[in-house]
């Protein structure tokens, strides 16, 4: 079992760009998590 205690949202915005010529979207990073502001110096969300 992993001992990771927190997720790791990037400190910058995740990208969300439509793929050219299709109706699908492309994402990067931890796009599926809630976009909550982490405390300074931390990647933690509650």
């Amino acid at each position: 079992v992993s001992s990771v205690q927190t997720p790791h949202l990037p400190t910058h915005a995740d990208s969300q760009t439509p793929s050219a010529g299709t109706d699908t979207q492309t994402f990067s990073g931890s796009a599926a998590n809630a976009k909550l502001n982490p405390t300074p110096g931390s990647n933690a969300i509650s």
């Epitope: 990208s15 796009a31 599926a32 909550l36």
Partner: antibody, heavy 116, light 109 residues
Framework: QVQLVESGGGVVQPGRSLRVSCEAS????????MHWVRQAPGKGLEWVAV????????FYADSVKGRFTISRDNSQNTLSLQMSSLRAEDTAVYYC?????????WGQGTLVTVSS | KIVMTQSPATLSVSPGERATLSCRAS???????LAWYQQRPGQAPRLLIY???TRATGIPARFSGSGSGTEFTLTISSLQSEDFAVYYC??????????FGGGTKVEIK
């Protein structure tokens, strides 16, 4: 502590349906994207599906698109995968995993065997 | 779709030695969103490294990740008995789909 517990696996005939579930505890479930990842016997890992933290977006691997449906109930801290038109190649251990795009916690998995 | 290729498929190493595992992407992984997982026999995978080089909480310092673009490396500085396992890389720089490498089995020499 974070816990993910899968259930619902078993033996099913080709063409039939099965629903597997994942019960989450130890964290705020509604803040996290959730995934299903599978592993065929003796093989590597294959991402199956993701659902956004709030259920607003769902995406699937091409191999299961149109046959599998991912869903979540944030009031019950549960994740589900409804599998239909099952094929022999869907035989695998199915893991639920937490994360926005990578997977920081995994359940222990539930085995789905598709066989006549 | 970004295809991830790991090499070698099997790595035979003696305890205490260094192991270097390679992961190559078919196109550049934006943001260096590359993760490494360890899977011991009969167990679920465990996150080791995310963002190409950041150790997950509780992961020993002997595990380190490096690389950028299309070439990434996981290094285990001094192999312990519990480190003999299969290791997978995974990109989350452009998805869906999220894609894994085929794995590298680290076995006792």
């Amino acid at each position: 502590q974070v816990q993910l517990v899968e259930s619902g696996g078993g033996v099913v005939q080709p063409g039939r349906s099965l629903r597997v579930s994942c019960e989450a505890s130890g964290f705020t479930f509604s803040n996290y994207g959730m995934h299903w990842v599978r592993q065929a016997p003796g093989k590597g890992l294959e991402w199956v599906a993701v659902i956004w933290y709030d259920g607003s977006k769902k995406f699937y691997a091409d191999s299961v698109k149109g046959r599998f449906t991912i869903s979540r109930d944030n009031s019950q801290n549960t994740l589900s995968l409804q599998m239909s038109s099952l094929r022999a190649e869907d035989t695998a251990v199915y893991y639920c995993a937490r994360g926005g795009g990578d997977f920081d916690f995994w359940g222990q998995g539930t085995l789905v065997t598709v066989s006549s | 779709k970004i295809v991830m290729t790991q090499s070698p498929a099997t790595l035979s190493v003696s305890p205490g030695e260094r192991a270097t595992l390679s992961c190559r992407a078919s196109q550049s992984v934006s943001g260096n969103y590359l993760a490494w997982y360890q899977q011991r026999p009969g167990q679920a995978p465990r996150l080791l490294i995310y963002g190409a080089s950041t150790r997950a909480t509780g992961i020993p310092a002997r595990f380190s990740g490096s690389g950028s673009g299309t070439e990434f490396t996981l290094t285990i500085s001094s192999l312990q008995s519990e480190d003999f396992a299969v290791y997978y890389c995974q990109q989350y720089g452009k998805w869906p789909p999220l894609t894994f490498g085929g794995g590298t089995k680290v076995e006792i020499k």
